[in-house]
């Protein structure tokens, strides 16, 4: 491509030249593809609202839990077990939490009257000891409740444990009470207030609308918009039993999904509530199942700071708000249409694939001869020829050879390495069909000239008897008219080519060779046809006529312009042309690759 470009180069437009195939089958396939693709594109556009600009929801949540629970605690006082009744209200069983969560206590373990002093550890595998050697001064085990003093002391009876400095008495390692102490929390209700905003669409709304009946309770089918939820119902929705979860605690997700269509003509923006258990219900005992934490109530007794430690089991409810708001946007629509246009090319890809497959050598040689029902597919070879133009890479080694006694042309795409071109087999290439309209450009004399009596026509060249070989003709010559090459040794083999593959009459003896290639009148006409005011001296005229004769022969014998560029003229023809239009001095240069 040239380095500089003119202004006119800028104002250009390139387009592809197409082949239109009039075919019922391929037409049907094309429209089938187009209808299917168009239907899918339209369906996806409408069902997924791909014409909208979508924006994620921004949300804030506020919750209120209501309910009263009566708790029956079993306590030991002076070695006697007593049943204590107490009432728990919202302040007793809920704890302030961060983010979109709230917690409801369902069970607990109390260790009362703890103060800081020395005492034996609660007996466990890690704290039981038989001597002081089993304890270490200053040791703090992650599972322990204090710092070891290094002494092994009696805990109870004959049980000895390591002494620690800690809040004493040490909290007992025991299971959560069964059933859960606040089992009635199943009947507690929670009101969820959820405000949402789509700032990009300048739209705000909330889950509680002005006309809402605040005595309602959420039900998946009967009351799906009620923002008041009974805790037991939430667990029933997920297939869990509240009483079972209440013992060890757990985590429950309340999902609020906003799928908002903010277009005026289809406006809809209401929440959908769903529930999901978020903790691992299959957890092994060693991996701490459920949900619990400890908190303490501190007080002073006789000027000594004491505390009641409570291990709280309960359910943490996480409110997860998500969703999108969509509004019509012309840019989104254009982008979507643009992204789907390429799908319409699938029909062309598929049909091209069929044409290429059915016109392959494999089908021609292995399928069509045996399969009669596949015969109609042979038409694809015709389509393929019309659709595709095969071009051979113009390597320096590329040469085309045409023998008068062969119907095809030979392509030689290799180095000769000292072998005569006559002897190189090459690859058979079909001879291009003759375009007879080109003959109309030749002078009338060529058409009208009557056949000369006794002059053999080209068709007579196919006679079986061979012309006698002249004594000077080289070994590779089959027509008896070839001459040895004058080129250096390294390039000589390129000119060692005859007009025939098998012995016979030379093409130069044909009347058409004389009329098309050697006729000065015809060649001058062709030169003037290209340059009407051409005026040359004898020497340059001979040179121009000689090269025009080479070109005429190549076009005549090879047909295709591309092949003619790489055509090697037989020695007999080359020397006959040189004899007719000689060079006054110096050697002939021979064939040169055009690229």
């Amino acid at each position: 491509m040239p380095a500089c470009c003119s202004c006119s180069d800028v104002f250009q437009y390139e387009t592809n030249k197409v082949t239109r195939i009039q075919s019922m089958n391929y037409g049907t396939i094309k429209w089938f593809f187009h209808v299917i693709i168009f239907s899918y594109v339209c369906f996806a556009l409408v069902s997924d609202k791909l014409y909208q600009r979508k924006e994620p929801v921004i949300s804030s949540v506020h919750t209120k839990v209501k309910g009263i629970a009566e708790v029956k605690e079993e306590i030991v006082e002076n070695g006697v077990k007593k049943l204590v009744h107490s009432v728990f209200d919202t302040a007793d069983y809920t704890f302030p939490l961060q983010g979109n969560s709230f917690f409801v206590m369902t069970n607990f373990l109390k260790t009362e009257g703890q103060e800081q002093r020395l005492c034996p550890e609660y007996p466990t595998r890690r704290t039981l000891c038989s001597s002081d050697r089993g304890c270490k001064k200053g040791w703090m085990d992650p599972q322990s409740k204090g710092i070891q003093t290094g002494r092994c002391v009696v805990y109870e009876g004959n049980q000895k444990t390591c002494e620690v400095s800690a809040w004493c008495p040490i909290e007992a390692v025991e299971e959560a009470p069964r059933p859960a102490l606040l089992n009635s929390a199943e009947n507690f209700t929670v009101l969820i207030k959820n405000n949402i905003d789509f700032p990009g669409h300048n739209y705000t709304t909330r889950n509680i609308l002005p006309g809402l009946n605040i005595t309602c309770t959420f039900h998946k089918t009967q009351n799906p918009q009620c923002p008041i939820f009974r805790l037991g119902d939430i667990f029933r929705e997920t297939g869990d039993n509240f009483s079972d979860v209440a013992i060890q605690g757990g985590i429950m997700g309340i999902e609020i999904y906003w799928d908002c269509n903010l277009d005026r003509w289809f406006h809809h923006c209401r929440p959908k509530y769903s529930f999901r258990r978020l903790d691992d219900k299959t957890t092994n005992v060693s991996l701490y199942p459920g949900y619990n934490f400890r908190y303490a109530k501190y007080y002073k007794e006789n000027n000594v700071e004491k505390r009641t430690l409570i291990k709280v089991f309960g359910i943490r409810f996480d409110i997860l708000v998500f969703g999108t708001g969509g509004k019509f946007d012309i840019i989104q629509l254009v982008v979507y249409i643009g992204s789907t246009l390429s799908y319409f090319g699938l029909a062309a890809v598929f049909i091209d694939f069929l044409i290429d497959t059915y016109s392959s050598n494999c089908c021609r040689s292995h399928i069509y001869p045996w399969c009669k029902c596949c015969q109609p597919c042979v038409v694809n070879e015709y389509y393929y020829r019309k659709k595709c133009e095969s071009i051979v890479e113009p390597k320096p080694t590329l040469k085309y050879v045409s023998f008068v006694d062969e119907s095809h042309i030979r392509m030689v795409n290799q180095q000769l390495l000292g072998r005569s071109l006559q002897d190189v087999k090459g690859q058979e290439v079909p001879r291009p069909a003759m375009d007879f309209t080109d003959l109309s450009r030749l002078p009338l004399a060529l058409h009208d000239t009557p056949p000369i009596p006794g002059q053999p026509e080209e068709i007579q060249l196919l006679r079986k008897e061979a012309t006698p070989r002249s004594r000077d003709s080289p070994v590779w010559c089959q027509c008896g008219s070839c001459l040895p090459s004058q080129l250096p040794e390294s390039h000589r083999c390129l000119e060692e080519l005859c007009c025939r593959k098998k012995p016979g009459a030379c093409i130069t003896t044909s009347e058409l060779f004389r009329k098309l290639v050697l006729s000065r009148h015809v060649l001058q006409f062709l030169l003037l046809y290209q340059e009407p005011l051409l005026a040359l001296d004898v020497d340059s005229t001979n040179s121009r006529l000689r090269h025009c004769a080479y070109r005429c022969y190549a076009t005549w014998r090879f047909g295709s312009q591309d092949m003619a560029d790489f055509a090697i003229l037989p020695s007999c023809c080359r020397w006959r042309i040189r004899k007719e239009f000689p060079k006054s001095e110096g050697q002939y240069s021979g064939f040169k690759s055009p690229y």
């Epitope: 595998r125 890690r126 270490k136 599972q143």
Partner: nanobody
Framework: EVQLVESGGGVVQPGGSLRLSCAAS????????MGWFRQAPGKEREFVAA???????DYGDSVKGRFTISRDDAKNTVPLQMNSLKPEDTALYYC???????????????????????WGQGTLVQVSS
């Protein structure tokens, strides 16, 4: 769950040697601290030797310098090499295992029988002339 089987016990003369072996079943053997304890008739169970999952060892005062504990995690075995045996070494020798999956047993606790959850049936060692 780990099953432990002791072997190698028998009668030996004072000053002689014996090699006890404890074979454990279970794929998580390498996560267990292993110990040897012994109980002579009419006496309390006594600590002999132990080896943690990461290879640290501890020996009872009466066997230090004479007994050697090791472990082969590939074969799931814990051998106890007993040299210079004395008549007072006569006892029923037990193999024990302590789970260290959720936390290593501190070295100073390896001798505590309370640390060990799993116990073998025992193998008898008799030292007499």
């Amino acid at each position: 769950e780990v099953q432990l089987v002791e072997s190698g016990g028998g009668v030996v003369q004072p000053g002689g040697s014996l090699r006890l072996s404890c074979a454990a079943s279970g794929r998580t053997f390498r996560h267990y601290a292993m110990g040897w304890f012994r109980q002579a008739p009419g006496k309390e169970r006594e600590f002999v030797a132990a080896i943690s999952s990461y290879g640290s060892t501890d020996y009872g005062d009466s066997v230090k310098g004479r007994f050697t504990i090791s472990r082969d995690d590939a074969k799931n075995t814990v051998p106890l090499q007993m040299n210079s045996l004395k008549p007072e070494d006569t006892a029923l020798y037990y193999c024990a295992a302590a789970d260290e999956t959720l936390g290593a047993v501190p070295n100073f606790r390896l001798h505590e029988k309370y640390e060990y959850e799993y116990w073998g049936q025992g193998t008898l060692v008799q030292v007499s002339s």
